[in-house]
Amino acid sequence: QAGPLPKPTLWAEPGSVISWGNSVTIWCQGTLEAREYRLDKEESPAPWDRQNPLEPKNKARFSIPSMTEDYAGRYRCYYRSPVGWSQPSDPLELVMTGAYSKPTLSALPSPLVTSGKSVTLLCQSRSPMDTFLLIKERAAHPLLHLRSEHGAQQHQAEFPMSPVTSVHGGTYRCFSSHGFSHYLLSHPSDPLELIVSGSLEDPRPSPTRSVSTAAGPEDQPLMPTGSVPHSGLRRHWE
């Protein structure tokens, strides 16, 4: 007897982080033998949607014409072939931005920082929130979470970076969120450009915009050092 059917691939276009009101298409790619594709959403009792395969039958399209809170969440897909159902795909986490007002992102003491020194990025929200996320543009692993302990609500989160190197230079934004849904984020803060200049020992000029290369430092997760801030938030990075 043949083994289990290979699991399909699940992805979203233009991406998995979508602003409120924008359209998104979820794709599930299986095999040419697929007869039906099914999309399941975590905590949804019935199959969330089901579609015929598109020719040549190896994938299906699930359209969301206008992103709302209801669509945010964790999805998996399956396909059915003449011999039965496939294994589930790896999960897709569809995140909606625009659920809350935008926070303010600032750098202390300044967004102009000398290599080797320290800087703290401060994300502040008007209303109390329990999760703050810092995102660096063009980083392969851009999310850094600070989540409050015991559900305590906070107006701000500090992201200390020490010692700063040229890798830390670039454009940052932050988001705020409530813990009851990791899939609903605020509008993004206005961008903050962190400019790292060379130290006395290292006088090389530092570019004011980070440039991502195929295997350059921008592809590494942002891992700032320093003590956990005193705001009652715990650091989580992905």
């Epitope: 007869r35 039906e36 959403k41 949804s44 009792p45 019935a46 199959p47 969330w48 949607d49 089901r50 579609q51 015929n52 209801d70 003449p82």
Partner: antibody, heavy 120, light 107 residues
Framework: EVQLQQPGAELVKPGASVKLSCKAS????????MHWVKQRPGQGLEWIGE????????NYNEKFKSKATLTVDKSSSTAYVQLNSLTSEDSAVYYC?????????????WGQGTSVTVSS | DIVMTQTTSSLSASLGDRVTISCRAS??????LNWYQQKPDGTVKLLIY???RLHSGVPSRFSGSGSGTDYSLTISNLEQEDIATYFC?????????FGGGTKLEIK
């Protein structure tokens, strides 16, 4: 006991619209898709489309895309089909049926059907 | 769309007979074939799903078989209450489609 309750009959004028209801009981309404099926007098069964009551996702038979609109009201566990621009061709019995969703993709419980007569 | 054909539109049989109703699909439907009974008053019930599985509460005199494009419903010992029209339906792809029905009458 699973029950799908539909009104017995509707008399409507040509060009008008009608909204048919199907009230579900005896199971968790949001856990099963709902189908709508048309049967003209003395004819076979035609699938109009299906709706997921938990999120409102729909799939339609292309033939009925401009004729029928499927909706649900979760608070009353009721599914609806609205038929617009009615003509004599729309005179038929309309059934709602619950989706079994497992092997077969069958419709395991059916309403009694609503007879729609289009006449001036 | 997949076309479902029930070539016999009506069938006469005697009580106690073994009756077979056939259904053909325009393409392989991978056993996603269901059978329904419609009584003269319009009531519709599911009898068999996935070719051969008996729906709950359906008498065991009903059975189904087939594969690929050809399927059949058998009533092993015809009873008066079985007088009805029988429809096949494919659940393999959207849109769902039905056969034209076979009306079963008593001789």
């Amino acid at each position: 006991e699973v029950q799908l309750q539909q009104p017995g009959a509707e008399l409507v004028k040509p060009g008008a619209s009608v909204k048919l209801s199907c009230k579900a009981s005896g199971y968790t309404f949001t856990s099963y898709w709902m189908h709508w099926v048309k049967q003209r007098p003395g004819q076979g069964l035609e699938w109009i489309g299906e709706i997921n009551p938990s999120n409102g996702r729909t799939n339609y038979n292309e033939k009925f895309k401009s004729k029928a609109t499927l909706t649900v009201d979760k608070s009353s566990s009721t599914a609806y089909v609205q038929l617009n621009s009615l003509t004599s061709e729309d005179s038929a019995v309309y059934y709602c049926a619950r989706d079994r969703y497992d092997e077969g993709n069958a419709m395991d419980y059916w309403g009694q059907g609503t007879s729609v007569t289009v006449s001036s | 769309d997949i076309v479902m054909t029930q070539t016999t539109s009506s069938l006469s049989a005697s009580l106690g007979d073994r009756v077979t109703i056939s259904c053909r699909a325009s393409q392989d439907i991978t056993n996603y074939l269901n059978w329904y009974q419609q009584k003269p008053d319009g009531t519709v019930k599911l009898l068999i799903y996935y070719t051969s599985r008996l729906h709950s509460g359906v008498p065991s005199r009903f059975s189904g078989s087939g594969s690929g494009t050809d399927y059949s419903l058998t009533i092993s010992n015809l009873e008066q209450e079985d007088i009805a029209t029988y429809f096949c339906q494919q659940g393999d792809t959207l849109p769902r489609t039905f056969g034209g029905g076979t009306k079963l009458e008593i001789k």
